[in-house]
Protein backbone atom coordinates (compact mmCIF):
# COMPACT_ATOMS: atom_id res chain seq x y z
CA UNK A 1 0.00 0.00 0.00
CA UNK A 2 1.25 3.46 -0.92
CA UNK A 3 -0.58 6.37 0.76
CA UNK A 4 -1.62 9.39 -1.29
CA UNK A 5 -0.21 12.86 -1.17
CA UNK A 6 -3.12 15.28 -0.86
CA UNK A 7 -2.98 18.87 -2.03
CA UNK A 8 -5.77 21.48 -1.91
CA UNK A 9 -5.64 24.44 -4.29
CA UNK A 10 -7.93 27.33 -5.11
CA UNK A 11 -8.56 29.28 -8.28
CA UNK A 12 -10.78 32.17 -9.30
CA UNK A 13 -14.04 30.95 -10.82
CA UNK A 14 -16.31 33.96 -11.28
CA UNK A 15 -16.94 37.15 -9.40
CA UNK A 16 -17.33 36.29 -5.73
CA UNK A 17 -16.68 32.58 -6.28
CA UNK A 18 -13.65 30.34 -6.23
CA UNK A 19 -13.10 26.74 -7.26
CA UNK A 20 -11.36 24.60 -4.67
CA UNK A 21 -9.71 21.41 -5.87
CA UNK A 22 -8.47 18.53 -3.77
CA UNK A 23 -5.92 16.33 -5.53
CA UNK A 24 -4.64 12.96 -4.37
CA UNK A 25 -1.65 11.45 -6.11
CA UNK A 26 0.90 8.69 -5.82
CA UNK A 27 -1.38 6.15 -4.14
CA UNK A 28 -1.83 2.39 -4.51
CA UNK A 29 -4.16 0.52 -4.73
CA UNK A 30 -6.53 2.63 -6.78
CA UNK A 31 -9.55 2.51 -4.41
CA UNK A 32 -9.91 5.89 -2.70
CA UNK A 33 -12.58 8.16 -1.21
CA UNK A 34 -12.11 11.85 -1.85
CA UNK A 35 -14.89 14.31 -1.04
CA UNK A 36 -15.68 17.74 0.33
CA UNK A 37 -17.24 18.50 3.71
CA UNK A 38 -19.08 21.73 4.49
CA UNK A 39 -19.74 22.69 8.11
CA UNK A 40 -18.53 19.23 9.13
CA UNK A 41 -21.03 17.20 7.08
CA UNK A 42 -20.97 15.83 3.55
CA UNK A 43 -21.35 18.28 0.72
CA UNK A 44 -24.13 17.22 -1.65
CA UNK A 45 -22.84 15.16 -4.56
CA UNK A 46 -24.39 17.38 -7.20
CA UNK A 47 -22.15 20.28 -6.16
CA UNK A 48 -18.94 18.26 -6.47
CA UNK A 49 -17.05 17.22 -9.58
CA UNK A 50 -14.81 14.16 -9.52
CA UNK A 51 -11.96 13.28 -11.83
CA UNK A 52 -11.31 9.71 -12.94
CA UNK A 53 -8.78 7.65 -11.01
CA UNK A 54 -5.90 7.48 -13.47
CA UNK A 55 -2.46 5.86 -13.49
CA UNK A 56 0.28 8.41 -13.05
CA UNK A 57 3.00 6.39 -14.74
CA UNK A 58 4.79 5.20 -11.61
CA UNK A 59 2.58 2.24 -10.81
CA UNK A 60 0.44 4.50 -8.63
CA UNK A 61 -2.71 6.53 -9.20
CA UNK A 62 -4.07 10.06 -9.04
CA UNK A 63 -7.51 11.70 -8.85
CA UNK A 64 -9.25 14.90 -7.79
CA UNK A 65 -12.50 16.40 -6.53
CA UNK A 66 -13.53 20.03 -6.94
CA UNK A 67 -16.35 22.32 -5.87
CA UNK A 68 -17.26 25.96 -6.30
CA UNK A 69 -17.69 28.05 -3.17
CA UNK A 70 -18.21 31.67 -2.20
CA UNK A 71 -15.05 33.62 -1.61
CA UNK A 72 -14.62 34.26 2.11
CA UNK A 73 -16.27 30.98 3.12
CA UNK A 74 -13.19 28.83 2.68
CA UNK A 75 -13.00 28.05 6.40
CA UNK A 76 -16.28 26.14 6.17
CA UNK A 77 -14.84 23.53 3.79
CA UNK A 78 -12.47 20.59 4.22
CA UNK A 79 -11.39 17.83 1.88
CA UNK A 80 -11.77 14.31 3.28
CA UNK A 81 -9.57 11.48 2.05
CA UNK A 82 -9.80 7.79 2.88
CA UNK A 83 -7.43 5.18 1.46
CA UNK A 84 -6.68 1.66 2.67
CA UNK A 85 -8.19 2.28 6.09
CA UNK A 86 -6.31 5.54 6.66
CA UNK A 87 -7.94 8.93 6.38
CA UNK A 88 -7.21 12.61 6.74
CA UNK A 89 -8.85 16.00 6.32
CA UNK A 90 -7.35 18.97 4.51
CA UNK A 91 -8.40 22.62 4.78
CA UNK A 92 -8.62 25.15 1.99
CA UNK A 93 -5.53 27.39 2.02
CA UNK A 94 -6.19 31.04 2.88
Amino acid sequence: TVPPMVNVTRSEASEGNITVTCRASGFYPWNITLSWRQDGVSLSHDTQQWGDVLPDGNGTYQTWVATRICQGEEQRFTCYMEHSGNHSTHPVPS
Epitope: T33, D39, G40, V41, S42, E73, Q75, R76, E82, G85
Partner: antibody, heavy 119, light 107 residues
Framework: DVQLQGSGPGLVKPSQSLSLTCSVT???????YYWNWIRQFPGNKLEWM?????????NYNPSLKNRISITRDTSKNQFFLKLSSVTTEDTATYYC???DGRGAWFAYWAQGTLVTVSA | DIQMTQSPASLSASVGETVTITCRAS??????LAWYQQKQGKSPQLLVY???TLADGVPSRFSGSGSGTQYSLKINSLQPEDFGNYYC?????????FGAGTKVEIK
Protein backbone atom coordinates in the same frame (compact mmCIF):
# COMPACT_ATOMS: atom_id res chain seq x y z
CA ASP B 1 -7.58 24.40 26.88
CA VAL B 2 -11.08 25.33 25.81
CA GLN B 3 -13.87 25.09 28.37
CA LEU B 4 -17.61 25.52 27.94
CA GLN B 5 -19.98 26.33 30.79
CA GLY B 6 -23.74 26.38 30.45
CA SER B 7 -26.02 28.36 32.73
CA GLY B 8 -29.61 29.47 33.02
CA PRO B 9 -32.83 29.04 35.02
CA GLY B 10 -33.75 25.53 36.05
CA LEU B 11 -37.49 26.12 35.96
CA VAL B 12 -39.57 27.62 33.14
CA LYS B 13 -43.35 27.92 32.92
CA PRO B 14 -45.25 26.46 29.95
CA SER B 15 -45.75 28.86 27.01
CA GLN B 16 -42.78 30.97 28.15
CA SER B 17 -39.32 31.10 26.60
CA LEU B 18 -36.34 29.09 27.76
CA SER B 19 -33.04 31.03 27.68
CA LEU B 20 -29.60 29.52 28.32
CA THR B 21 -26.06 30.88 28.11
CA CYS B 22 -22.86 29.07 27.18
CA SER B 23 -19.68 30.84 28.29
CA VAL B 24 -16.51 29.81 26.47
CA THR B 25 -13.02 30.25 27.89
CA UNK B 26 -9.69 29.43 26.29
CA UNK B 27 -10.81 30.03 22.71
CA UNK B 28 -12.52 32.82 20.79
CA UNK B 29 -15.84 31.70 19.36
CA UNK B 30 -15.20 33.89 16.29
CA UNK B 31 -11.92 32.18 15.37
CA UNK B 32 -13.27 28.83 14.23
CA TYR B 33 -15.58 25.94 15.08
CA TYR B 34 -19.28 25.33 15.44
CA TRP B 35 -20.98 26.11 18.73
CA ASN B 36 -23.94 23.86 19.41
CA TRP B 37 -26.83 23.15 21.71
CA ILE B 38 -27.84 19.54 22.38
CA ARG B 39 -30.46 18.34 24.80
CA GLN B 40 -31.09 15.05 26.57
CA PHE B 41 -34.62 14.13 27.56
CA PRO B 42 -35.60 12.08 30.59
CA GLY B 43 -35.04 8.54 29.35
CA ASN B 44 -31.70 9.65 27.83
CA LYS B 45 -32.64 10.39 24.21
CA LEU B 46 -30.20 12.95 22.75
CA GLU B 47 -31.32 15.63 20.30
CA TRP B 48 -29.09 18.03 18.38
CA MET B 49 -30.79 21.44 18.40
CA UNK B 50 -28.55 23.63 16.27
CA UNK B 51 -25.40 25.71 16.07
CA UNK B 52 -23.97 29.13 15.56
CA UNK B 53 -20.75 29.04 13.57
CA UNK B 54 -17.53 31.03 13.99
CA UNK B 55 -18.83 33.30 11.24
CA UNK B 56 -22.21 33.80 12.88
CA UNK B 57 -24.32 31.58 10.61
CA UNK B 58 -26.95 29.25 12.06
CA ASN B 59 -28.22 25.77 11.36
CA TYR B 60 -31.22 24.46 13.29
CA ASN B 61 -32.94 21.11 13.68
CA PRO B 62 -36.15 21.30 11.62
CA SER B 63 -37.98 19.46 14.42
CA LEU B 64 -37.80 22.68 16.44
CA LYS B 65 -39.52 24.60 13.63
CA ASN B 66 -39.52 28.32 14.33
CA ARG B 67 -39.14 28.06 18.10
CA ILE B 68 -35.33 28.12 18.27
CA SER B 69 -32.81 30.94 18.08
CA ILE B 70 -29.07 30.69 18.74
CA THR B 71 -27.21 33.97 19.03
CA ARG B 72 -23.90 35.18 20.45
CA ASP B 73 -22.16 38.02 22.20
CA THR B 74 -18.64 38.09 20.81
CA SER B 75 -17.44 40.65 23.36
CA LYS B 76 -18.27 38.24 26.18
CA ASN B 77 -17.35 35.10 24.22
CA GLN B 78 -20.78 33.65 24.92
CA PHE B 79 -23.50 32.08 22.84
CA PHE B 80 -27.14 31.67 23.72
CA LEU B 81 -30.12 29.42 23.23
CA LYS B 82 -33.66 30.74 23.15
CA LEU B 83 -36.52 28.29 22.81
CA SER B 84 -39.98 29.83 22.71
CA SER B 85 -43.44 28.50 23.53
CA VAL B 86 -42.09 25.70 25.70
CA THR B 87 -44.18 22.78 26.92
CA THR B 88 -43.49 20.03 29.41
CA GLU B 89 -42.00 18.08 26.46
CA ASP B 90 -39.06 20.50 26.53
CA THR B 91 -38.02 19.33 30.00
CA ALA B 92 -34.46 18.09 29.47
CA THR B 93 -30.81 18.50 30.33
CA TYR B 94 -29.32 21.06 27.94
CA TYR B 95 -25.69 20.89 26.84
CA CYS B 96 -23.57 23.28 24.86
CA UNK B 97 -20.89 21.58 22.78
CA UNK B 98 -18.31 22.27 20.09
CA UNK B 99 -17.32 20.57 16.88
CA ASP B 100 -14.84 21.51 14.19
CA GLY B 101 -15.00 21.57 10.41
CA ARG B 102 -13.18 18.27 9.98
CA GLY B 103 -16.42 16.58 10.96
CA ALA B 104 -19.50 17.20 13.08
CA TRP B 105 -18.55 15.10 16.08
CA PHE B 106 -18.60 16.69 19.51
CA ALA B 107 -15.21 16.66 21.21
CA TYR B 108 -16.01 19.30 23.85
CA TRP B 109 -19.14 19.43 26.01
CA ALA B 110 -20.22 21.61 28.91
CA GLN B 111 -21.77 20.08 31.97
CA GLY B 112 -25.51 19.80 31.53
CA THR B 113 -28.12 22.30 32.72
CA LEU B 114 -31.36 20.66 33.79
CA VAL B 115 -34.40 22.69 32.74
CA THR B 116 -37.83 21.68 33.97
CA VAL B 117 -40.93 23.06 32.31
CA SER B 118 -43.73 23.13 34.83
CA ALA B 119 -46.49 25.40 35.99
CA ASP C 1 -33.68 12.71 8.25
CA ILE C 2 -31.37 9.78 8.91
CA GLN C 3 -32.51 7.62 11.82
CA MET C 4 -30.00 5.71 13.94
CA THR C 5 -31.06 2.38 15.47
CA GLN C 6 -28.85 1.02 18.23
CA SER C 7 -28.78 -2.50 19.65
CA PRO C 8 -28.92 -3.96 22.14
CA ALA C 9 -30.75 -1.47 24.37
CA SER C 10 -28.84 -2.86 27.34
CA LEU C 11 -26.33 -5.56 28.14
CA SER C 12 -24.62 -7.01 31.18
CA ALA C 13 -21.11 -8.41 30.96
CA SER C 14 -18.28 -9.45 33.22
CA VAL C 15 -14.94 -7.73 33.57
CA GLY C 16 -12.59 -9.11 30.91
CA GLU C 17 -15.32 -9.97 28.43
CA THR C 18 -15.61 -8.50 24.96
CA VAL C 19 -18.81 -6.64 24.10
CA THR C 20 -20.10 -5.27 20.81
CA ILE C 21 -22.68 -2.55 20.30
CA THR C 22 -24.19 -2.02 16.88
CA CYS C 23 -25.74 0.97 15.16
CA ARG C 24 -27.77 0.89 11.96
CA ALA C 25 -28.43 4.01 9.90
CA SER C 26 -31.57 4.41 7.79
CA UNK C 27 -29.37 5.39 4.84
CA UNK C 28 -25.74 5.11 3.76
CA UNK C 29 -23.71 7.46 5.97
CA UNK C 30 -20.34 6.64 4.40
CA UNK C 31 -18.46 6.29 7.73
CA UNK C 32 -19.68 9.68 8.99
CA LEU C 33 -20.24 8.20 12.44
CA ALA C 34 -19.15 8.97 16.01
CA TRP C 35 -19.48 7.03 19.27
CA TYR C 36 -19.81 8.48 22.78
CA GLN C 37 -19.72 7.15 26.32
CA GLN C 38 -21.80 8.78 29.04
CA LYS C 39 -21.64 8.05 32.73
CA GLN C 40 -24.45 8.84 35.14
CA GLY C 41 -24.74 12.58 35.77
CA LYS C 42 -21.92 13.46 33.33
CA SER C 43 -21.69 14.83 29.81
CA PRO C 44 -21.12 12.45 26.90
CA GLN C 45 -17.48 11.87 25.98
CA LEU C 46 -16.25 11.28 22.45
CA LEU C 47 -14.77 7.82 21.89
CA VAL C 48 -14.59 7.35 18.10
CA TYR C 49 -15.09 9.51 15.02
CA UNK C 50 -15.11 8.80 11.29
CA UNK C 51 -16.34 5.32 12.32
CA UNK C 52 -12.88 4.00 13.15
CA THR C 53 -10.65 6.70 14.64
CA LEU C 54 -10.12 6.74 18.39
CA ALA C 55 -10.40 10.16 20.00
CA ASP C 56 -7.45 11.45 22.03
CA GLY C 57 -6.92 9.60 25.28
CA VAL C 58 -9.34 6.76 24.54
CA PRO C 59 -7.97 3.34 25.56
CA SER C 60 -7.07 0.96 22.74
CA ARG C 61 -9.53 -1.65 24.01
CA PHE C 62 -12.19 0.42 22.23
CA SER C 63 -12.49 0.03 18.47
CA GLY C 64 -14.95 1.13 15.81
CA SER C 65 -15.78 -0.57 12.53
CA GLY C 66 -18.39 -0.74 9.82
CA SER C 67 -19.45 0.83 6.55
CA GLY C 68 -22.55 1.80 4.64
CA THR C 69 -25.43 1.56 7.08
CA GLN C 70 -23.99 -0.87 9.67
CA TYR C 71 -21.47 0.13 12.36
CA SER C 72 -20.10 -1.41 15.54
CA LEU C 73 -18.28 -0.38 18.67
CA LYS C 74 -16.28 -3.16 20.29
CA ILE C 75 -14.86 -3.09 23.81
CA ASN C 76 -12.18 -5.71 24.37
CA SER C 77 -11.49 -6.88 27.90
CA LEU C 78 -14.25 -4.86 29.56
CA GLN C 79 -13.08 -2.83 32.56
CA PRO C 80 -15.12 -1.68 35.59
CA GLU C 81 -14.86 1.94 34.41
CA ASP C 82 -16.54 1.05 31.09
CA PHE C 83 -20.03 0.90 32.56
CA GLY C 84 -22.44 3.58 31.37
CA ASN C 85 -24.44 4.49 28.29
CA TYR C 86 -23.06 4.43 24.75
CA TYR C 87 -24.46 6.43 21.83
CA CYS C 88 -23.79 6.57 18.12
CA UNK C 89 -24.25 9.75 16.09
CA UNK C 90 -24.13 10.32 12.35
CA UNK C 91 -22.84 13.48 10.69
CA UNK C 92 -23.58 12.67 7.07
CA UNK C 93 -26.15 15.47 6.82
CA UNK C 94 -28.26 17.82 8.90
CA UNK C 95 -30.02 17.29 11.20
CA UNK C 96 -27.40 15.39 13.17
CA UNK C 97 -29.06 12.50 14.98
CA PHE C 98 -28.12 10.08 17.75
CA GLY C 99 -28.98 6.49 18.49
CA ALA C 100 -31.21 5.77 21.49
CA GLY C 101 -28.27 4.41 23.46
CA THR C 102 -26.99 1.14 24.89
CA LYS C 103 -26.69 0.71 28.64
CA VAL C 104 -23.64 -1.37 29.59
CA GLU C 105 -23.76 -2.86 33.07
CA ILE C 106 -20.95 -4.76 34.75
CA LYS C 107 -21.95 -8.16 36.12
Amino acid sequence: DVQLQGSGPGLVKPSQSLSLTCSVTGYSITNDYYWNWIRQFPGNKLEWMGFISFGGSNNYNPSLKNRISITRDTSKNQFFLKLSSVTTEDTATYYCARYDGRGAWFAYWAQGTLVTVSA
Amino acid sequence: DIQMTQSPASLSASVGETVTITCRASGNIHNYLAWYQQKQGKSPQLLVYDAITLADGVPSRFSGSGSGTQYSLKINSLQPEDFGNYYCQHFWSFPLTFGAGTKVEIK
